[in-house]
Interface confidence: low
C-alpha cells in the first residue's frame, strides 16, 4: 500500500536472531513526525502492536519490546507511522524484517575445509551438519546483518549436511550455523559452537554476499 508518508525504518536490537525466552527491541523510526507507530507481524501468528511515538532531535521513534521470545512471536515484521490517531493515516510500510527464534533444537556442527586457518586467496568451505533432519542450514558471520542459507543435502553417514563455499579467503571472522525445518522458517536450532576462521596474509573486508551463491535460496518473507 502506498501510504501518505514515506516509509519508516525498522531495526532489531541487539539483532534479528533471538534466543528462546530472550527479548528483542524492534525500533521503528523516521524523520517524519509520526505520533503513532504500528508494528505488524506476518507469520504463523499474525498480530499488530501500537505505540505512541517519542520525539527527539527531529526523529520520531517507538521501541517495541518483543519477548520473552517464543515461536508465535517470530515472523516478518513491518512498521508503519501515522500522524493522526482518528482516523489513522498509515505511511508506506518499512522494509520487512524477519525475526527468528533460535535455541529450539539440537545444535549442528560447523567445520572448515581444508581447516580454520587458511592462506589469503586459498579456497575455504564451511560445512554445517547434524544428525537431526534439518531441511535448511543458515550460516552467520559475526558483525554481518544477513545469513547465507543452503538446503541440507541427503543423509550421508547418518548426518544431514550443507556446504557453504566461501571462495578465496580474504578475511577471517567468527562463524556460526543453525538448522531449521522447511515448514517453520522462523524457528531455528541452537547455534553451533563458534568457528574462528583465520586468514594469514592481507585481509580485506569482504565475505560472500548472501545474495551471491546461485545454489542458495532467498530469505523467507511470508508463510502465507
Amino acid at each position: 500500500h502506498e501510504g501518505v508518508h514515506r516509509k519508516p525504518s525498522l531495526l532489531a536490537h541487539p539483532g534479528r536472531l533471538v534466543k528462546s525466552e530472550e527479548t528483542v527491541i524492534l525500533q521503528c523510526w523516521s524523520d517524519v513526525r509520526f505520533e503513532h507507530f504500528l508494528l505488524h507481524r506476518e507469520g504463523k501468528f499474525k498480530d499488530t502492536l501500537h505505540l505512541i511515538g517519542e520525539h527527539h532531535d527531529g526523529v520520531s521513534k517507538a521501541n517495541f519490546s518483543i519477548g520473552p521470545m517464543m515461536q508465535d512471536l517470530a515472523g516478518t515484521y513491518r512498521c508503519y507511522g501515522s500522524v493522526t490517531h482518528s482516523p489513522y493515516q498509515l505511511s508506506a510500510p518499512s522494509d520487512p524484517l524477519d525475526i527468528v527464534i533460535t535455541g529450539l533444537y539440537e545444535k549442528p556442527s560447523l567445520s572448515a575445509q581444508p581447516g580454520p586457518t587458511v592462506l589469503a586467496g586459498e579456497s575455504v568451505t564451511l560445512s554445517c551438519s547434524s544428525r537431526s533432519s534439518y531441511d535448511m542450514y543458515h550460516l552467520s558471520r559475526e558483525g554481518e546483518a544477513h545469513e547465507c542459507r543452503f538446503s541440507a543435502g541427503p543423509k550421508v553417514n547418518g548426518t544431514f549436511q550443507a556446504d557453504f563455499p566461501l571462495g578465496p579467503a580474504t578475511h577471517g571472522g567468527t562463524y556460526r550455523c543453525f538448522g531449521s525445518f522447511r515448514d517453520s522458517p522462523y524457528e531455528w536450532s541452537n547455534s553451533s559452537d563458534p568457528l574462528l576462521v583465520s586468514v594469514t596474509g592481507n585481509p580485506s573486508n569482504s565475505w560472500p554476499s548472501p545474495t551471491e551463491p546461485s545454489s542458495k535460496t532467498g530469505n523467507p518473507r511470508h508463510l502465507h
Epitope: H50, F64, G67, H85, P87, Y88
Partner: antibody, heavy 122, light 108 residues
Amino acid sequence: EVQLVQSGAEVKKPGSSVKVSCKASGGTFSSYAISWVRQAPGQGLELMGGIIPIFGTANYAQKFQGRVTITADESTSTAYMELSSLRSEDTAVYYCATSGGYSYFLSPLDYWGQGTLVTVSS
Amino acid sequence: EIVLTQSPGTLSLSPGQRATLSCRASQSVSSNYLAWYQQKPGQAPRLLIYGASGRATGIPDRFSGSGSGTDFTLTISRLEPEDFAVYYCQQYGSSPLTFGGGTKVDIK
C-alpha cells in the same frame, strides 16, 4: 467513546455452528483490534482471538484454531465470530472487546460488548 | 503462554474494609502490561487498572494497582457496597493474552 453492540442470544444443537455479530460505533472501526472473549457459566474469561479490519488478518488462540473464524465488514462496522462443531461445553457468554485502537496485545480491553449467550443443547 | 494465578479464590469482607487481591504470573510480564477488571453478575467486565498501576478513566481512587515482574496486587482501600464483584487480572504484554481465574469479593 467506542460502543460495541452484540447480536442476541442463540440456542444451538451440538455439531452446528453459531455466528455472533458485534457492531461498533464511535470511532474508526477499521483501526480497532476487535477481540473475542468467552465465559462459560460460573467460569473465568478466555480469549478466543481477534481481528484488525484494516489488515484483514485474524489471530486465533491455539485452543480454538480450526473451529473459530473471525471476520469483519468495514462497510457496516461489524465484526463476526463464527464457532463451528459446537459441543455442550461451548455454552457460554461470548463478548467482543476492544482497546479502541490497533493491538491484539500491548493494549488492555477498554470497551466491551454486552455479551451474547450461546446455549448448546440437544 | 503466561499463566496467571489469582488468590484468594474468594475474599469475604465487610463494607469499609480494605481488600487486597493477588495475581501471580508464571513468567515475568513484559513491561508490566497487566490489567485488572471488575465483573458484576450479568455484566461485561470493566477495566479498572492498566499497566499494573494506572487507573482507567472514571475509576475511583480507592482502587490501586501495584507490583512488577511476576507479582501484582489490586488494593481496594475502603470497600463500598458496589465493589462486591469478581476481579480478574490479565496480562497483555505477550501473545496469547491471558486472564487469571478471578477472585470473588463477597459480603461477610
